[in-house]
């Protein structure tokens, strides 16, 4: 999708639905692209992103990507279509209301990614193991 500072022409008349056939509406996500971050060794972090946007496409969800290498830590916040890979990974948890970070294998860095389907859910990124799929809040499927 497009970052907040880039404009684009959008004319698409499809009705987008989720897996259950319900009409999918766009949602509000933090959208700062890549920023340096101080989030490290914490159970959860706030994004510290001051830019909120309505995703351009109804099917898009909120995504956060946390990366750490020898030099710095960055946090990326965007809207993205879960049907398409992001950073070569599938967004498995796109229906979750919370952004639960999962580690992905990337050479030369520590790489965590999460996606979620409630407004501004990528503002609070969760690393803690206590939030797992047995948490009833994660079983809540949200279409906003």
């Amino acid at each position: 999708t497009i970052p907040p500072h880039v404009q684009k022409s959008v004319n698409n008349d499809m009705i987008v639905t989720d897996n259950n056939g319900a009409v999918k509406f766009p949602q509000l996500c933090k959208f700062c692209d890549v920023r340096f971050s101080t989030c490290d060794n914490q159970k959860s972090c706030m994004s510290n992103c001051s830019i909120t946007s309505i995703c351009e496409k109804p099917q898009e969800v909120c995504v956060a990507v946390w990366r750490k290498n020898d030099e710095n830590i960055t946090l990326e916040t965007v809207c993205h279509d879960p049907k398409l890979p992001y950073h070569d990974f599938i967004l498995e948890d796109a229906a979750s209301p919370k952004c639960i970070m999962k580690e992905k294998k990337k050479p030369g860095e520590t790489f965590f990614m999460c996606s979620c389907s409630s407004d501004e859910c990528n503002d609070n990124i969760i690393f803690s193991e206590e939030y797992n799929t047995s948490n009833p809040d994660l079983l809540l499927v949200i279409f906003q």
């Epitope: 766009p26 995703c55 496409k57």
Partner: antibody, heavy 116, light 110 residues
Framework: EVQLLESGGGLVQPGGSLRLSCAAS????????MSWVRQAPGKGLEWVSW????????YYADSVKGRFTISRDNSKNTLYLQMNSLRAEDTAVYYC?????????WGQGTLVTVSS | QSVLTQPPSASGTPGQRVTISCTGS????????VSWYQQLPGTAPKLLIY???HRPSGVPDRFSGSKSGTSASLAISGLRSEDEADYYC???????????FGGGTKLTVL
């Protein structure tokens, strides 16, 4: 069927307070963010406030910041708007609406009149 | 003064096509999806278009929306007397951190 029913409007003096409620039914209230939008008599729509599904995130229009407080009780399927230090320019029909990216359902509105 | 600019009025005859414009800036329409709302006299607003060009179920395909750059527009084809209403565009403003509406356009069917 999705229904939003506002209540709590009425006549109040400048400087006074009111608490509006919005009772939701027909959908899983705790899964949706909610908003308040108002419309002064004969004027256009003005967004007032928004609250996330789990009330972690709230936003307010500059015109009400510091005076109005949005809250929700998911166990009661109810949205609230606490309005303090009311001014004449707050006179309007107040609507609660579902979501923020697109207000897909609206209540019928409750009239708030601020006058001495 | 509204953040989004709409013409205060528009008119057309039955069967005609009418377009209502909505102009904003890079912090609102330029970077956020736009919605359109219809408000019939004495009633609450109703969602007409979301995500720039998508229609909720139940909205006739005579209504269509589009967006380009920092402007959006609502087109109504095959105008009918029941389309006489106020129309509002709306979107998030990433600079103001709030939702913004246009001033509204009163559509008259002559």
């Amino acid at each position: 069927e999705v229904q939003l029913l506002e209540s709590g409007g009425g006549l109040v003096q400048p400087g006074g307070s009111l608490r509006l409620s919005c009772a939701a039914s027909g959908f899983t209230f705790s899964s949706y963010s909610m908003s308040w939008v108002r419309q002064a008599p004969g004027k256009g729509l003005e967004w007032v406030s928004w609250i996330s599904y789990n009330d972690r995130s709230v936003y307010y229009a500059d015109s009400v910041k510091g005076r109005f407080t949005i809250s929700r009780d998911n166990s009661k399927n109810t949205l609230y708007l606490q309005m303090n230090s009311l001014r004449a320019e707050d006179t309007a029909v107040y609507y609660c609406a579902r979501r923020i990216a697109a207000f897909d359902y609206w209540g019928q509105g409750t009239l708030v009149t601020v006058s001495s | 003064q509204s953040v989004l600019t709409q013409p205060p009025s528009a008119s057309g005859t039955p069967g005609q096509r009418v377009t209502i414009s909505c102009t904003g800036s890079s912090s609102n329409i330029g970077s956020n999806a736009v919605s359109w709302y219809q408000q019939l006299p004495g009633t609450a607003p109703k969602l007409l278009i979301y995500a720039n060009s998508h229609r909720p179920s139940g909205v006739p395909d005579r209504f269509s929306g589009s967006k380009s750059g920092t402007s959006a527009s609502l087109a109504i084809s095959g105008l009918r007397s029941e389309d006489e209403a106020d129309y509002y565009c709306g979107t998030w403003d990433s600079s103001l951190s709030g939702y913004v509406f246009g001033g509204g356009t009163k559509l008259t069917v002559l």
